[in-house]
């Protein structure tokens, strides 16, 4: 006799692990044999879907390899045309070992900001997430919290928060660990010890001291009156993320010295500044005609002639003393290209030492003129012919510019070392002895003011004149 379908074994909830097999059984008694269809979340499962196997006249539905997306309500419906269709439903719960779907990544963060290390997980049952810092479980506090999502949030990041982190996802089926990531805490550059201001005497040595810290360790640069420091020696040392910079200066003029500590955070820089003033005692004293200051020679023309690191007098009656005095020498040197090999080095030494006069120590900078004897040696011994020609040209007005006249000293207006050996500067490049003076032109005056005594020999000489040269 025909019999309406009856589901004798209703569907039950099935627990299945990912990639395992899950089977629903829908046992039906009926006559004639019913047609059985299956749905998942009310969507018909097609018979030809290769992910499923439907056997025993449709009474067995097997999911061949469970995926987490297979979760849902599965129903079987039986119908044989006799009476109404019958349905039974059951849930598939996909059980899953913990899986970290969005692992944490290395983070660089500036101290004081908020850091979030992500750790998004999957798993059924829902995994619990904890964090490890270094080798120890991370304890939550008012600043550090593990969010519902599993991410680690650190408010007001501190230097001590830096280190290696990993997240751990755990459920009843297993545990998953993320790879170890690094939290780097960067700290804005900060000056720990600012340079101190000094009031010193002209020609003193001063060491300015600047200490800074930061992560990464900052670099320190020194600025003098708004420009990069041009002279002085800088010594640096780094220890425990602290950089110590010492600028040693030879003080020849007042200045504002700024220590700038800089470090880089991604594409941005952080800087910290501290300044010190160097004032010179009695610097403001009126200087009348000898207005100027002393500084190390930074030009090119006189490099080989002037003593290394020597201080020279820069005359502030020029708008740009260094440039103006360099131009004076340059103009004069061009005239020297045609002079004899005996005259040229002597004349170069004279010009450079006359235009860039040596500085003497004291309360205010004062230039030291060349000794008359050395000037006369150049004029009447080394460059006798050339000097006559030059004087003749000057008298006849053959020079296009008057500039060269400023370059050539008037020997008679220079102090003699005979009367005061400390009143004037020697030219170390002129190295000759009394016997070399046998070719010296005869003197028209017996006064000591034009006498050339034996000039002191110099170990730093660049040339010497021997008696074999004829000066006539």
């Amino acid at each position: 006799l025909p019999k309406a379908p009856v589901i004798t074994t209703p569907l039950e909830t099935v627990d299945a692990l990912v990639e395992e097999v899950a089977t629903f059984m829908c046992a039906v008694e009926s006559y004639p044999q019913p047609e059985i269809s299956w749905t998942r979340n009310k969507i018909l499962i097609k018979l030809f879907d290769t992910r499923y196997s439907i056997r025993e006249n449709g009474q067995l539905l097997t999911i061949l390899s469970v995926e987490d997306s297979d979760d849902g309500i599965y129903c079987c419906t039986a119908n044989n045309g006799v009476g109404g269709a019958v349905e039974s439903c059951g849930a598939l719960q996909v059980k899953m070992k913990p899986k970290i779907t969005r692992p944490p990544i290395n983070v660089k963060i500036i101290e004081g900001l908020k850091a979030v290390l992500p750790c998004t997980t999957m798993g059924n049952p829902k995994p619990s997430v904890s964090w490890i810092k270094g080798d120890s479980p991370l304890r939550e506090n008012s600043r550090i919290a593990v969010l519902e999502s599993g991410s680690l949030r650190i408010h007001n990041v501190q230097k001590e928060d830096a280190g290696q982190y990993r997240c751990v996802a755990k459920n009843s089926l297993g545990t998953a660990y993320s790879k170890v990531v690094k939290l780097e805490v960067e700290v804005f550059a900060r000056i720990l010890r600012a340079p101190e201001s000094h009031n010193v005497t002209f020609g003193s040595f001063v060491t300015l001291h600047c200490t800074a810290t930061g992560i990464p360790v900052p670099t320190i640069t020194w600025i003098e009156n708004g420009n990069a420091v041009s002279s002085g020696s800088i010594q640096e040392s780094v220890k425990d993320r602290v950089i110590d910079s010492r600028l040693q200066l030879f003080i020849t003029k007042p200045g504002l010295y700024t220590c700038i500590a800089t470090n880089k955070h991604g594409e941005k820089f952080s800087t910290a500044k501290a300044a010190a003033t160097i004032s010179i005692a009695e610097w403001s004293k009126p200087q009348k005609d000898n207005k100027g200051y002393c500084a190390q020679y930074r030009g090119e023309v006189c490099n080989a002639v002037l003593a290394k690191d020597a201080l020279v007098f820069l005359n502030t009656s020029y708008a740009d003393p260094e440039e103006a005095q360099e131009l004076l020498v340059h103009t004069a040197w061009n005239e020297l290209k045609v002079v004899s090999p005996v005259c040229r080095p002597a004349a170069e030494a004279l010009l450079c030492n006359h235009i860039f006069q040596e500085c003497s120590p004291g309360v205010v900078p004062t230039p030291i003129p060349i000794c008359r004897e050395y000037c006369l040696a150049v004029k009447e011994l080394f460059c006798a012919k050339e000097w006559l020609v030059m004087e003749e040209k000057t008298h006849r007005g053959l020079y296009r510019s008057e500039m060269h006249l400023l370059s050539v000293p008037e020997c008679s207006k220079l102090p003699s070392m005979h009367w005061d050996p400390t009143a004037c500067a020697r030219l170390p490049h002129l190295d000759y002895n009394k016997e070399n003076l046998k070719t010296f032109p005869p003197m028209t005056s017996s006064k000591p003011s034009v006498d050339i005594p034996n000039l002191p020999s110099s170990s730093s000489s660049s040339f010497s004149v021997s008696p074999t040269y004829s000066m006539t």
Epitope: G203, D289, N290, C294, P361, G362, W419, D420, A423
Partner: antibody
Framework: EVQLVESGGGLVQPGGSLSLSCVAS????????MNWVRQAPGKGLEWLSV???????YYADSVKGRFTISRDNVKNTLYLQLNNLKPEDTALYYC?????????WGQGTQVTVSS | DIVMTQSPSSVTASAGERVTINCRSS????????????LNWYQQRLGQSPRLLIY???ARESGVPDRFSGSGSTTNFTLTISSFQPEDAAVYYC?????????FGSGTRLEIK
Amino acid sequence: EVQLVESGGGLVQPGGSLSLSCVASGFTFSLYYMNWVRQAPGKGLEWLSVIDTHSIAYYADSVKGRFTISRDNVKNTLYLQLNNLKPEDTALYYCVLGRTALVRWGQGTQVTVSS
Amino acid sequence: DIVMTQSPSSVTASAGERVTINCRSSQSVLYSSNQKNYLNWYQQRLGQSPRLLIYWASARESGVPDRFSGSGSTTNFTLTISSFQPEDAAVYYCQQSYKPPYGFGSGTRLEIK
């Protein structure tokens, strides 16, 4: 030969003034720094003042504000004006040629401050 | 101000003897720009004006016998008479000329034995 001849010394009462002169010869006076140095009876040397070729002057603290150094390059003469004299200013006053060393010395002129 | 300290205050020597006089400055008198020490030595014989012997710590003034020599650097200096002669009996002074005021030492009296 360099000659430095001081004059103008003498006996003066405390609070009084004197003007010392030093006439230079034998060298181009205007090109050199000049100094005054004194020596109290039986005592050591005391540097007082220097004047450079541009007439910029420096003084020892003991005489600053009371003594004034000056020069006349036309007359080849160095001066020291002594004001508000005290008994401790009693000394032989030397005129000396020299920039950073006291190279040539005069014979000195005696200043006595006494009531 | 730079203070100059001389020692000893007095010394006696026989002819031919080596004599040294010391001078110390309270701060450096070495000028780094030219590496010169701005330290001078003077001799003052009884009843005479002082006479420059040594400038720049070691440069002998012209006419000064070569038995006189100066040495030292920065703050410590020495005047040496290699072979004392009777005419060397005098008071010797050191003086700094690094910066004004150019102070003298208190002097060392050198007498013949």
